[in-house]
């Protein structure tokens, strides 16, 4: 009910009016408009789209819409010197070369500036050597190779299949193993769902399709040359040798037709078990090198990409709040794409566009939100979340004092099965309440709520009758807001059935085949899932900006803190003797969590009972809610990851996409039995328990009565 009494200007404009204004037909039209040509970061086409969006947001009625530019490090293939991989014989002759481009989809043959598949930020190089197949190139895959199979990757070119973890982690692992180059490929086991045809006849990846993507390990730094500071005209830039997160070995992606040619000749050790075998008709031997007849043949990479400082443009739109203009609710998603961006990002950008249009319509009728809403079209997300991070670095002092919430709006769909939400625990109740009010778009759930279909299809593993909400990881533009600045954040999209579809991401992710037609023909012909996502994202923004009392429930944080403390304690208890030897105790952490739980409960009672008509008291309580997420930030950051500062959540050190809880303790405990100096290793565990305890206790105290 909170939003219906949102402002005293036009109370008739409640959330229903906002939601009713959202139209599937408009989202469809916007998506078509945004996907006719490539919008690669740093290109003229993407600058023109930024100006178009600026113009349209102004027309829609926002108070102001500005372009903010930064000069950041980007990476492009050399137009005259293409990247490829070859098999060479003993005379050095190339007997096989991988393809130089993806065959363009029908109707797009004459489109210019389709960037060929490449691994952004790969250094130049022409390494040559034997191949080692490393499965997904995860930490555990290299453990298996090095520890169990005694296979040494030093001096070898490794070939890894895409999937399971962020590609940058794969490259980092390969570097640490001593590899001289990395070939990434899409295996049909991960990118070809059974019973579905290849594009253009279905949504599966054809053999010539390739996933582009950056291979950085930025750990939240933003522009590699200006970590911590905006890449503006007076910025000091590091030299390339000191740049953050750049890979040190050449990397290149290929499709499964080309991968077949490389993998079919592999010799050496057999794959350790079925989890290492994909769906190609090859033996999946690990190597090193080719089998008998082909043992004198080598693999050679030819990588000539260049990294260059390039101008990027964000679009920032403002809808000024009527009551608390100095409190910001942000809705942001990126605009840059690898090629056409049919799903990533334009299915999200089209939804943001329609949300802006709906808010603008209400504003033209005299309504204003209680708090200021900022809308952002980020640039260069695909190159390392650069646009959002640079803007947040430039505005960090404002954001840390005024930022209420950030809602992310990348791809609206990665499937059409059910809703997927990742958010701070503070937003759980907001999401539950909102989805109970929205209609499900799912077949078989006509007239039922979104909450009901979501709960049925994606049940919580812990709480029966409730849907699953996941931890925030990274790999998208919320990263700087949540992990660095401690602003409550959330994201929502429609997803696949993870039970039956085991492939990673959607098959055509980051390929030339991610087109408007892919969405319109195969994923969402009626754009009903897009509309639902618009309602969820827009509804969250509306409530966050308009509720008299912020729709955050601190008791939900208390519940997960206990769960995470139990989990990390159980991991540590796999080493009972060391815990005794080195006096490792989690008592202090459990005590802090207990204090947090009690204080959160009392705070919630006060929140329920206080006089909402007292503006000072209202602002005070809302500030305690707004600053709670901020209280989990450690200014010193996590070990070796200074821009990941949230003590409760961080991107996993082994997979940027995944979130890890109590990451400082988790990383200190990870593989601790292989640490040479146990006293030092367990000392670090104790230090991290201490940091976590202090942080939880300090956060609890921000919820105590102020005096």
């Amino acid at each position: 009910k909170s939003s219906s009494e949102a402002t005293n200007i036009t109370p008739k404009h409640n959330m229903k009016a906002f939601l009713d204004e959202l139209k599937a037909e408009n989202i469809k039209k916007f998506l078509h408009n945004f996907t006719q040509i490539p919008h690669l970061a740093g290109t003229e086409q993407n600058f023109q789209l930024a100006k178009q969006i600026q113009s349209q947001w102004k027309e829609f009625g926002l108070d102001s819409v500005e372009l903010t530019h930064y000069d950041v490090l980007l990476s492009y293939p050399n137009k005259t010197h293409p990247n490829y991989i070859s098999i060479i014989n003993e005379d050095g002759n190339e007997i096989f070369n991988t393809s130089l481009f993806e065959p363009p989809p029908a109707g797009y043959e004459n489109v210019s500036d389709i960037v060929p598949p490449f691994s952004a930020f790969s250094p130049q190089g022409m390494p040559e050597g034997d191949l080692v197949y490393v499965n997904y190139a995860r930490t555990e895959d290299f453990f298996k190779l090095e520890r169990d199979m005694k296979i040494n990757c030093s001096g070898k070119i490794v070939i890894a299949r895409y999937g399971k973890v962020f590609r940058g982690n794969k490259v980092k692992n390969a570097q640490l193993a001593g590899a001289t180059g990395v070939i990434l490929y899409s295996d049909p086991a991960d990118y070809f769902a059974p019973g579905v045809k290849s594009y253009p006849d279905g949504w599966n990846l054809p053999g010539g399709g390739v996933q582009r993507g950056n291979i950085l390990n930025l750990n939240g730094a933003g522009d590699p040359l200006t970590p911590g500071y905006p890449a503006n005209e007076y910025a000091y830039r590091r030299g390339m040798a000191e740049a953050v997160g750049l890979p040190s070995i050449p990397v290149h992606p290929i499709g499964y037709y080309d991968a077949q040619k490389l993998l079919e000749k592999m010799g050496g050790s057999a794959s350790p078990d079925s989890s290492w075998r994909g769906s190609l008709k090859v033996p999946y031997n690990v190597g090193p090198g080719f089998t008998g007849n082909f043992s004198t043949q080598k693999v050679k990479m030819h990588i000539h990409s260049t990294s260059e400082v390039t101008r990027i443009y964000n679009v920032i739109g403002t809808l000024r709040g009527a009551v608390e203009p100095d409190r910001y609710v942000i809705l942001g998603g990126h605009r840059d794409s690898w090629v056409f961006g049919g799903i990533d990002p334009q299915s999200g950008a089209a939804v943001v566009h329609e949300i802006v249009r709906s808010f603008g319509t209400l504003k033209k009728e005299g309504w204003r939100p209680r708090r200021t809403i900022l809308f952002a079209s980020w640039d260069a997300e695909e190159f390392g979340l650069l646009g959002s991070t640079e803007w947040a670095e430039e505005n960090s002092r404002l954001l840390q004092e005024r930022g209420v919430a950030y809602i992310n709006a990348d791809s609206s769909i990665e499937g059409n099965y059910t809703l997927r939400v990742d958010c701070t625990p503070l937003m759980y109740s907001l999401v539950y309440n909102l989805t109970k009010e929205l209609e499900s778009p799912d077949e078989g759930f006509e007239g039922k709520s979104l909450y009901e279909s979501w709960t049925k299809k994606s049940p919580s593993p812990e709480f029966s009758g409730m849907p699953r909400i996941s931890k925030l990881g990274s790999g998208n533009d919320f990263e700087v807001f949540f992990q660095r600045l401690g602003i409550a954040s959330g994201r929502a999209r429609y997803t696949k059935n993870w039970e039956t579809n085991k492939f990673s991401s959607y098959p055509l992710y980051h390929s030339v085949y991610e087109t408007y037609e892919l969405v319109e023909k195969f994923y969402d012909p009626m754009f009903k899932y897009h509309l639902t996502v618009a309602q969820v994202r827009g509804g969250m923004v509306f409530e966050l900006a308009n509720s008299v009392v912020l729709p955050f429930d601190c008791r939900d944080y208390a519940v997960v803190l206990r769960k995470y403390a139990d989990k990390i304690y159980n991991i540590s208890m796999k080493h009972p003797q060391e815990m005794k030897t080195y006096s490792v105790s989690f008592d202090s952490l459990f005590s802090a969590v207990k204090n947090f739980t009690e204080i959160a409960s009392k705070f919630s009672e006060r929140l329920r009972d206080f006089d909402k008509s007292n503006p000072i008291l209202l602002r005070m309580m809302n500030d305690q809610l707004m600053f709670l997420e901020r209280a989990f930030i450690d200014p010193l950051g996590l070990p070796d990851r200074p821009f990941y500062r949230h003590v409760i959540y961080a991107p996993s050190s082994h997979n940027k996409y995944a979130g890890e809880s109590f990451p400082g303790i988790y990383d200190a405990l990870f593989d601790i039995e292989s640490k040479v100096d146990p006293s030092q290793a367990w000392g670090e565990v104790k230090r991290q328990i201490s940091v976590a305890t202090f942080t939880v206790q300090a956060a609890a105290e921000t919820l105590s009565e102020v005096a």
Partner: antibody, heavy 116, light 107 residues
């Protein structure tokens, strides 16, 4: 505190057998890879064998000089690691140390003498 | 097998002197090199691991450096109790191998 205590050494004739034992304490034994390393005036320090933990399927590795003649094993319930040595030779003489992974902790050693 | 060669085999020094012990690997072993100290009638004790990390409890007069094939153990100011045997070892690949040792003696 980490403690490793070897036993089972002694005098044995060439061609004979001997089983060395090592009992560990002060750490969660089942998580750790264990080694045997020997020392003699002639050959200095020489790694003999390694046995890994259950999570690594108790994988074993041996030095070329002992392959086929020795078996490393472990009993996690007893926090113990063993070295069964068969077909012993004079050059197997030395002090045998039980060590933890990376050779970061060593026992006091047990002496094996192979002589007729 | 990777051969670890230590030199000198022995050296005579005075208390308070700075001493440098050298270890050379026959092929690249990254930084997977440890240094051990062995006192008479005792088992070896780890001093340095990962080429340059001091093991817990080791006095800071002991410093390790190097990578790939060349490694150094430096004792900044030798104490009487340091006049014992020192070994380097590699754990980069099987079989793990050790150097022949360097004996420090009183001048």
């Amino acid at each position: 505190e980490v403690k490793l205590e070897e036993s089972g050494g002694g005098l044995v004739q060439p061609g004979g057998s001997m089983k060395l034992s090592c009992v560990a304490s002060g750490f969660t034994f089942s998580n750790y890879w264990m080694n045997w390393v020997r020392q003699s005036p002639e050959k200095g320090l020489e790694w003999v064998a390694e046995i890994r933990s259950q999570s690594n399927n108790f994988a074993t590795h041996y030095a070329e000089s002992v392959k086929g003649r020795v078996i490393i094993s472990r009993d996690d319930s007893k926090s113990s690691v063993y070295l069964q040595m068969n077909n012993l030779r004079a050059e197997d003489t030395g002090i045998y140390y039980c060590t933890r992974r990376w050779n970061n902790f060593w026992g006091q050693g047990t002496t094996l003498t192979v002589s007729s | 097998n990777i051969v670890m060669t230590q030199f000198p085999k022995s050296m005579s020094i005075s208390v308070g002197e700075r001493v440098t012990l050298t270890c050379k690997a026959s092929e690249n072993v990254g930084t997977y090199v440890s240094w051990y100290q062995q006192k008479p009638e005792q088992s070896p004790k780890m001093l340095i691991y990962g080429a340059s990390n001091r093991f817990t409890g080791v006095p800071d007069r002991f410093t390790g450096s190097g990578s790939a094939t060349d490694f150094i153990l430096t004792i900044s100011s030798v104490q009487t109790e340091d006049l014992v045997d020192y070994y380097c070892g590699q754990s980069y690949t099987f079989p793990y191998t050790f150097g022949g040792g360097t004996k420090l003696e009183m001048k």
